[in-house]
């Protein structure tokens, strides 16, 4: 029998390579039972993790999960760092993993990108 | 039934590159890390790198960095492993393994492994 | 990296007896999580590597639980309380908590 507890499905470790000045969505997959939980998004500074409150978020509804969606319209080079999803669900505290984002300025990159970028932005192998 | 099916076995020339291959069932490659382990004949294990399929993000032991790419397909839950200038240093077995279930993400499902040999 | 160091290299056990092997590691392996990510593999002969034991002292389904892994920080040990035929091969720890990932050198577990 599956559990019933919200789950927050971030990996543990997980990295996104990412460009200033483009469009990004970090996504929370949320899994919950009957009523939707509150869920927010944090930005880990030192020990602390930063309640982002004026951020563009959203909900996309899938059959099996949810994704509660940080916006970047566009990514800053000060987003670089480490972000991780809360839920309250039946007043517990769930928190997710944390989830890091390398941010590449373009304006500072060299013209021949990591291996990792490549890797992680498939759209730059002409294979 | 979780399971790893890796390609069959190569043969290959010095100087040469090879592309194995490594698709899974059983679960989505996307909700996990799929990892490469090399072992040379006769000797222990060694970890190659991992790569998150669902955006395509790397990491390496640094002493691979040169020598080997990941790729992963979600469409054909199919991980790959390009390894890349041969010598006879990398004549071993490569497994692919399963980066394990949430919330942990440590290895357990082990492919069967593929058996490269460089020789001329 | 993170060293994996395991002794002894090679164990030669009587099926019946027990048998401990020792796996320490250079650095602290417990993560900001407040896990620690050590697991213990078995790779029988000719076969892949199979995990046995995963965040230290988990046993994995079907693992019998004359299989005991224990330690924390730097220090970890398997413990077989009763060895059987079927468990000869070559036991390697490997570390999750840092990268790059690594593994021990392994400990040949062989039947007297």
């Known amino acids: 029998k599956e559990s019933c507890d919200v789950q927050l499905y971030i990996k543990r470790q997980s990295e996104h390579s990412i460009l200033a000045g483009d469009p990004f969505e970090l996504e929370c997959p949320v899994k919950y039972c009957a009523n939707r939980p509150h869920v927010t998004w944090c930005k880990l500074n030192g020990t602390t993790c930063v309640k982002l409150e004026d951020r563009q978020t959203s909900w996309k509804e899938e059959k099996n999960i949810s994704f509660f969606i940080l916006h970047f319209e566009p990514v800053l080079p000060n987003d670089n760092g480490s972000y991780r999803c809360s839920a309250n669900f039946q007043s517990n505290l769930i928190e997710s993993h944390s989830t890091t984002l390398y941010v590449t300025d373009v304006k500072s990159a060299s013209e021949r990108p990591s291996k990792d970028e490549m890797a992680s932005r498939p759209w730059l192998l002409y294979r | 039934e979780v399971q790893l099916q890796q390609s069959g076995a190569e043969l290959v020339k010095p100087g040469a590159s090879v592309e194995l291959s490594c698709t899974a069932s059983?679960?989505?490659?996307?909700?996990?890390?799929i990892y490469w382990v090399k072992q040379r004949p006769e000797q222990g294990l060694q970890w190659i790198g991992r790569?998150?399929?669902?955006?395509?993000?790397?990491k390496y032991d640094p002493r691979f960095q040169d020598k080997a790419t990941l790729t992963a397909e979600i469409s054909s839950n199919t991980a790959h492993l390009q390894l890349n200038s041969l010598t006879s240093e990398d004549t071993a077995v490569y497994f692919c393994?399963?980066?394990?279930?949430?919330?942990?993400?440590?290895?357990?499902?082990w492919g069967q492994g593929t058996s490269v040999t460089v020789s001329s | 990296a993170v060293v994996m160091t395991q002794t002894p290299l090679t164990l030669s056990v009587t099926i019946g007896q027990p048998a401990s092997i020792s796996c320490k590691s250079s650095?602290?392996?417990?993560?900001?999580?407040?896990?620690?990510?050590l697991i213990w593999l078995l790779q029988r002969p000719g076969q892949s590597p199979m995990r046995l034991i995963y965040?230290?002292?988990k046993l994995d389904s079907g693992v019998p639980d004359r299989f005991t892994g224990s330690g924390s920080g730097t220090d970890f040990t398997l413990k077989i309380s009763r060895v059987e035929a079927e468990d000869l091969g070559i036991y390697y720890c490997?570390?999750?908590?840092?990268?790059?990932?690594?593994f021990g050198g392994g400990t040949k577990l062989e039947i007297k």
């Open positions: 393994v399963r980066g394990g279930d949430h919330p942990y993400y440590v290895m357990d499902w």
């Open positions: 059983g679960f989505n490659i996307k909700d996990t890390y």
């Open positions: 790569i998150d399929p669902a955006n395509g993000h790397t």
């Open positions: 650095q602290n392996l417990l993560d900001s999580d407040g896990k620690t990510y």
């Open positions: 965040l230290v002292s």
């Open positions: 490997w570390q999750g908590t840092h990268f790059p990932r690594t």
